[in-house]
């Protein structure tokens, strides 16, 4: 396993609809054909997998069914979007990139993006 640098923004604020987007960029040392991108959430020293995708360079990302993530790729950048976020989902979201093919295998883990989610205030009832 060889190391690879991965960069991502330090902080992102989710929209009022619970959508957060950020760019995950990796420094590809070789001729990557297939890349796996995994988003991990770290909260209270626990790490859980949020979503994972695989893609061939130049093609769209393939996420597993029922994924809360979507994304696009451009060169060595992956634009990730996480949907359905609520205030309780606030935390550090780490981008993990693996160059799956061809060998040798490279692994890179970003420092994480702190995503802040603020639940929208419910609309007050109006009297007409």
């Amino acid at each position: 396993c060889k190391a690879m640098h991965v960069a991502q923004p330090a902080v992102v604020l989710a929209s009022s609809r619970g959508i957060a987007s950020f760019v995950c960029e990796y420094a590809s040392p070789g001729k990557a054909t297939e890349v796996r991108v995994t988003v991990l959430r770290q909260a209270d020293s626990q790490v859980t997998e949020v979503c994972a995708a695989t893609y061939m360079m130049g093609n769209e990302l393939t996420f597993l069914d029922d994924s809360i993530c979507t994304g696009t790729s451009s060169g060595n950048q992956v634009n990730l979007t996480i949907q359905g976020l609520r205030a309780m989902d606030t935390g550090l979201y780490i981008c993990k990139v693996e160059l799956m093919y061809p060998p040798p295998y490279y692994l890179g883990i970003g420092n994480g993006t702190q995503i802040y989610v603020i639940d929208p205030e419910p609309c007050p009832d109006s009297d007409f």
Partner: antibody, heavy 118, light 107 residues
């Protein structure tokens, strides 16, 4: 449409070598890795190795590293599998297949039936 | 090497049935599981890639699921043209390995 054309059959003598061909059409040959798979009735499907037609980088299954050699001819969009020191164990159907995402093979040749017999 | 096991070597079902073919890996393959159909004449086609993604042109009656080491191919409303042998293949680690196949027959 994508097509991988392979000869239907080859009959060769034990101890000799053979070069199986796989002619690709319908896509940019150098943009996709080509893989080779061996099939025997009892042993099932075995991955032999792969080659990147753009620069001829290869990777082999250790079980085939002394048996198989993969090459390509970019000018004719053809991939080749050469098998050496043939024995009856090499009698099988050999498929070429184009690599797709998640290391799947989205298009396969019809297969070449290799018979090693004296 | 990762071993891929299809415990059922043959399966008999009636037209219109829903059938499930299973495949187990000797270690976690992280959803890099693909399914193929091989017809009696030797023709091989990709059905499902990355566990559940339907390859273009494949009828929607085919579906895939699973995670970790256990994966499944389901065929609903079985048709005569589905008579074939189905193979799973892991694409997580070289060398890529295949299951032994499950031959589907009509009752």
């Amino acid at each position: 449409q994508v097509q991988l054309q392979q000869p239907g059959a080859e009959l060769v003598r034990p101890g000799s070598s053979v070069k199986l061909s796989c002619k690709a059409s319908g896509y940019t040959f150098t943009s996709y890795w080509m893989h080779w798979v061996k099939q025997r009735p009892i042993q099932g499907l075995e991955w032999i190795g792969n080659i990147d037609p753009s620069d001829s980088e290869t990777h082999y299954n250790q079980n085939f590293k002394d048996k198989a050699t993969l090459t390509v001819d970019k000018s004719s969009s053809t991939a080749y599998l050469q098998l050496s020191s043939l024995t009856s164990e090499d009698s099988a159907v050999y498929y070429c297949a184009r690599r797709y995402t998640s290391s799947s093979f989205d298009y396969w040749g019809q297969g070449t039936t290799l018979t090693v017999s004296s | 090497d990762i071993q891929m096991t299809q415990t059922t070597s043959s399966l008999s079902a009636s037209l219109g049935d829903r059938v499930t073919v299973s495949c187990r890996a000797s270690q976690d393959i992280r959803n890099y599981l693909n399914w193929y159909q091989q017809k009696p004449d030797g023709t091989v086609k990709l059905l499902i890639y990355f566990t559940s993604k339907l390859h273009s042109g494949v009828p929607s009656r085919f579906s895939g699921s699973g995670s970790g080491t256990d994966y499944f191919l389901a065929i609903s409303n079985l048709e005569q043209e589905d008579i074939a042998t189905y193979f799973c293949q892991q694409g997580n680690t070289l060398p890529y390995t295949f299951g032994g196949g499950t031959k589907l027959e009509i009752k």
